[in-house]
């Protein structure tokens, strides 16, 4: 059974991930972002189901494309270089989902824009955090 300290750690990691995803979304939605139109052409894959930490596998598999999209944006839109930002997110995702369990992600048929994709994972983080508090 999860201890209160492990639950607290999970909650903090999810809050960190949530903040990173929100920061990316805000940077992309910045009205000064000249690359937004092109960014919206990138197709992202959404999980069929995302209710548990193991489902973060689906997010991990989209972090490569996410880094490429962020490379299009002006660096001043973000506090970190895309490579460093995604590296940080990868570390958090790996700790949350675990590296040993090989969960096969199932994707929804419909693809999404980067904005829809980020909103989906922001909602996921908020949902899990609410169950922990």
């Amino acid at each position: 059974a999860p201890t209160s300290s492990s639950t607290k750690k999970t909650q903090l990691q999810l809050e960190h991930l949530l903040l990173d995803l929100q920061m990316i979304l805000n940077g992309i939605n910045n009205y000064k972002n000249p690359k937004l139109t092109r960014m919206l052409t990138f197709k992202f894959y959404m999980p069929k189901k995302a209710t548990e930490l193991k489902h973060l596998q689906c997010l991990e598999e989209e972090l490569g494309p996410l880094e490429e999209v962020l490379n299009l944006a002006q660096s001043k839109n973000f506090h970190l270089r895309p490579r460093d930002l995604i590296s940080n997110i990868r570390v958090i995702v790996l700790e949350l989902k675990g590296s040993e369990t090989t969960f096969m992600c199932e994707y929804a048929d419909e693809t999404a824009t980067i904005v829809e994709f980020l909103n989906r994972w922001i909602t996921f983080c908020q949902s899990i955090i609410s169950t922990l508090t």
Epitope: R38, T41, F42, K43, Y45, Q57, E60, E61, G64, P65, E68, V69, N71, L72, L94, S99, M104, Y107
Partner: antibody, heavy 123, light 107 residues
Framework: QVQLVQSGAEVKKPGATVKISCKVS????????MHWVRQAPGQGLEWIGR????????KYAENFKGRVTITADTSTDTAYMELSSLRSEDTAVYYC????????????????WGQGTLVTVSS | DIVLTQSPATLSLSPGERATLSCQAS??????LSWYQQKPGQAPRLLIY???SLASGIPARFSGSRSGTDFTLTISSLEPEDFAVYYC?????????FGQGTKLEIK
């Protein structure tokens, strides 16, 4: 169906520069990141670098930085790879290949390849 | 840089047999691994992407699996046209790196 057609074989002397082309047909080049990979005779595959033809941003492998320049001409849907200060170890088949994030998950990998261009460096 | 180690270097089998090719990553790369087949004088051909997904037009006898940082390409029953060199490739971070290859030859 996307096709990549590369320029013909080249023979160069040590110290010279070679420029190889890769023409994309069946789609516009701006939909793809154009990557270059090489293979020395009887050896494995080695990633050189890539260009985003839409904004000309590039990434190069450390081994090639300073010697390689990847460019693209969107008006002709053609990518180029120029390698300077050639040495005998650069003798290899050079391939262009693609990645895109606009279509299916499969095309995020090296799904389309050119036929390869043999570059021979010999004095 | 991430190092991919393929084994064995050469695999000698007969048509109809099962082939198991291994690729080990020097660090965690998630599912960011693909497999390619290359025949003499030809460009590589994508077989498996995202560690386990079969590329379009590739026969179902090819399959990919992953356990941690160990990846496996399995050919369930070898056909004569399957004898070639196989490479794994990681897309987790640049520089993208390939394994040194496994040559699958007829016994």
């Amino acid at each position: 169906q996307v096709q990549l057609v590369q320029s013909g074989a080249e023979v160069k002397k040590p110290g010279a520069t070679v420029k190889i082309s890769c023409k994309v047909s069946g789609d516009t080049i701006t939909a793809y990141y154009m990557h270059w990979v090489r293979q020395a005779p009887g050896q494995g595959l080695e990633w050189i670098g890539r260009i985003d033809p839409d904004d000309d941003s590039t990434k190069y492998a450390e081994n090639f930085k300073g010697r390689v320049t990847i460019t693209a001409d969107t008006s002709t849907d053609t990518a180029y790879m120029e390698l300077s200060s050639l040495r005998s170890e650069d003798t290899a088949v050079y391939y262009c290949t693609t990645i895109t994030f606009l279509y299916t998950r499969e095309l995020r990998w090296f799904a389309y390849w050119g036929q390869g261009t043999l570059v021979t460096v010999s004095s | 840089d991430i190092v991919l180690t393929q084994s064995p270097a050469t695999l000698s089998l007969s048509p109809g047999e099962r082939a198991t090719l291994s690729c080990q990553a020097s660090q965690y790369i998630g599912n960011y691994l693909s497999w390619y087949q290359q025949k003499p004088g030809q460009a590589p051909r994508l077989l498996i992407y995202q560690a386990t997904s079969l590329a379009s037009g590739i026969p179902a006898r090819f399959s990919g699996s992953r356990s941690g940082t160990d990846f496996t390409l399995t050919i369930s029953s070898l056909e004569p046209e399957d004898f070639a060199v196989y490479y794994c490739l990681q897309h987790y971070s640049t520089p993208y790196t390939f394994g040194q290859g496994t040559k699958l030859e007829i016994k």
